[in-house]
């Protein structure tokens, strides 16, 4: 995870002035996945390459956020661009962040994990237990390494949360899961909440 | 009850390359990991690789980056194991291994010895 | 990577003993430690995992303890069937790794 946007990023630096106006224009027509939401229009518009990069990982997340770029610049004519955005798809295509699953737009839903970012981030203590129930499955090696660098729990909890706008639904899942096991009480005392 | 039944012996050539397989049942195949090991004869064991089989991801030691590629077929629970450009030196037996939680090993399968001689 | 030692490659035990066998991490390995036995005929069980957790369907005559980098698997009423050889791995880093093993045998 990471590298996505990354690629997303670099093609869209990429792009002259015009081809960017004309790849926004572009993305608010495009046909979108079910469960999907577009970005609108006023705020779109007004974005520089980084800006657009961040909002189409937040709304539609690395894996489908790339496959909509690729899309979009295939009917822009950009063939080379899409390519290698392409390859990216192909080579990072592992991690459970890069399964298809439809984000159910967590903005609107709001998942346990957004709602209460910051009082898991004050409360859990018992990080590593969180980490071994993510690896592999949801966080990568490298991702696991970092998180467990972190000196303090807060550190570590907000290092594991700077990966989660890359995550889909059933990643988000999986923290809450791993937290029910680990923080039962923690849990239930934010449910209430 | 889980159980990891790993395919019979390999009489290869040097240069060759093997797949050998892992065929995993009792559990969900997908929820867990399954790692490979390696251990020439009278000697300690050598951890190769592992795959996460609900996602593909899989993480090699750099030892064996390019001798061993780890799939996974989850229509039949089967893990695979292939080595490439064979030597002596990959004579050995393999074991495949389930991953638990703290990635121990919990469940280990009986092993396939690959012998490679011309 | 880090290196797992076990000091002591073979150990002979009379029948009732307590056995200690040891494992030494090259740095800390905060608990991620593991215990294999390997029988004679090859199969491998997982004993202790993460330090002292023991493994379900285990005899409670094998325990283990240690933290940083020392750790330690003991039988504390060593039995014929325990004739093996033990084996200890790290999973806390990449390459993950196992000890040269430790040969039990009865005196």
């Known amino acids: 995870m990471g590298r996505a946007r990354d690629a997303i990023l670099d093609a869209l630096e990429n792009l002259s002035g015009d081809e960017l106006k004309k790849f926004k224009m572009k993305l608010l027509t495009v046909q979108l996945r079910e469960g999907y939401g577009r970005i609108p229009r006023g705020a779109l518009l007004q974005m520089d390459a980084i800006d657009l990069t961040d909002k189409l990982v937040s709304y539609y997340l690395e894996s489908y956020g790339l496959e909509l770029t690729m899309t979009v610049l295939r009917d822009m004519g950009l063939q080379e661009l899409a390519e290698q955005l392409q390859t990216t798809k192909e080579e990072s295509g592992a991690v459970a962040a890069a399964a298809s699953v439809p984000a159910q737009s967590t903005a609107r839903t709001g998942h346990f994990v957004d709602q209460h970012r910051q009082a898991l981030i004050a409360r859990v203590t018992e990080v590593d237990g969180v980490l071994d129930a993510l690896h592999g499955s949801v966080l990568t090696e490298g991702q696991y390494q970092a998180v467990r660098a972190e000196t303090t729990s807060q550190d570590k909890m907000r290092k594991l949360f700077s990966f989660v706008p890359s995550w889909n639904l059933t990643c988000k899942d999986s923290l809450l899961q791993a937290l029910k096991e680990i923080h039962p009480y923690l849990v239930m005392d934010l449910e209430q909440s | 009850e889980v159980q990891l039944q790993q395919s019979g012996a390999e009489l290869v050539r040097p240069g060759s390359s093997v797949k050998m397989s892992c065929e995993t049942s009792?559990?969900?195949?997908?929820?867990?990991?399954l790692t490979w090991v390696k251990q020439r004869p009278g000697q300690g064991l050598e951890w190769i690789g592992y795959?996460?089989?609900?996602?593909?991801?899989?993480e090699y030691n750099e030892k064996f980056k390019d001798k061993a590629t780890l799939t996974s077929d989850t229509s039949s629970s089967i893990v695979y194991m292939q080595l490439s450009s064979l030597t002596s030196e990959d004579s050995a037996i393999y074991f495949c291994?389930?991953?638990?939680?703290?990635?121990?090993?919990?469940?280990w399968g009986q092993g396939t010895t690959l012998t490679v001689s011309s | 990577a880090i290196q797992m030692t076990q000091t002591t490659s073979s150990l002979s035990a009379s029948l009732g003993d307590r056995v200690t066998i040891s494992c030494r991490a090259s740095?800390?390995?905060?608990?991620?430690l593991h215990w294999y036995q390997q029988k004679p005929d090859g199969t491998v069980k997982l004993l202790i995992f993460?330090?002292?957790g023991l493994r379900s369907g285990v005899p409670s005559r094998f325990s283990g303890s240690g933290s940083g980098t020392d750790y330690s698997l003991t039988i504390s009423n060593l039995e014929q069937e325990d004739i093996a050889t033990y084996f200890c791995?790290?999973?806390?880093?990449?390459?993950?790794?196992f000890g040269g093993g430790t040969k039990l045998e009865i005196k």
């Open positions: 740095q800390d390995i905060s608990n991620y």
């Open positions: 009792g559990y969900t195949f997908t929820t867990y990991g």
């Open positions: 291994a389930r991953l638990g939680l703290r990635r121990h090993f919990d469940y």
């Open positions: 993460f330090t002292s």
């Open positions: 791995q790290q999973s806390i880093l990449l390459p993950w790794t």
């Open positions: 795959i996460y089989v609900g996602n593909g991801y899989t």
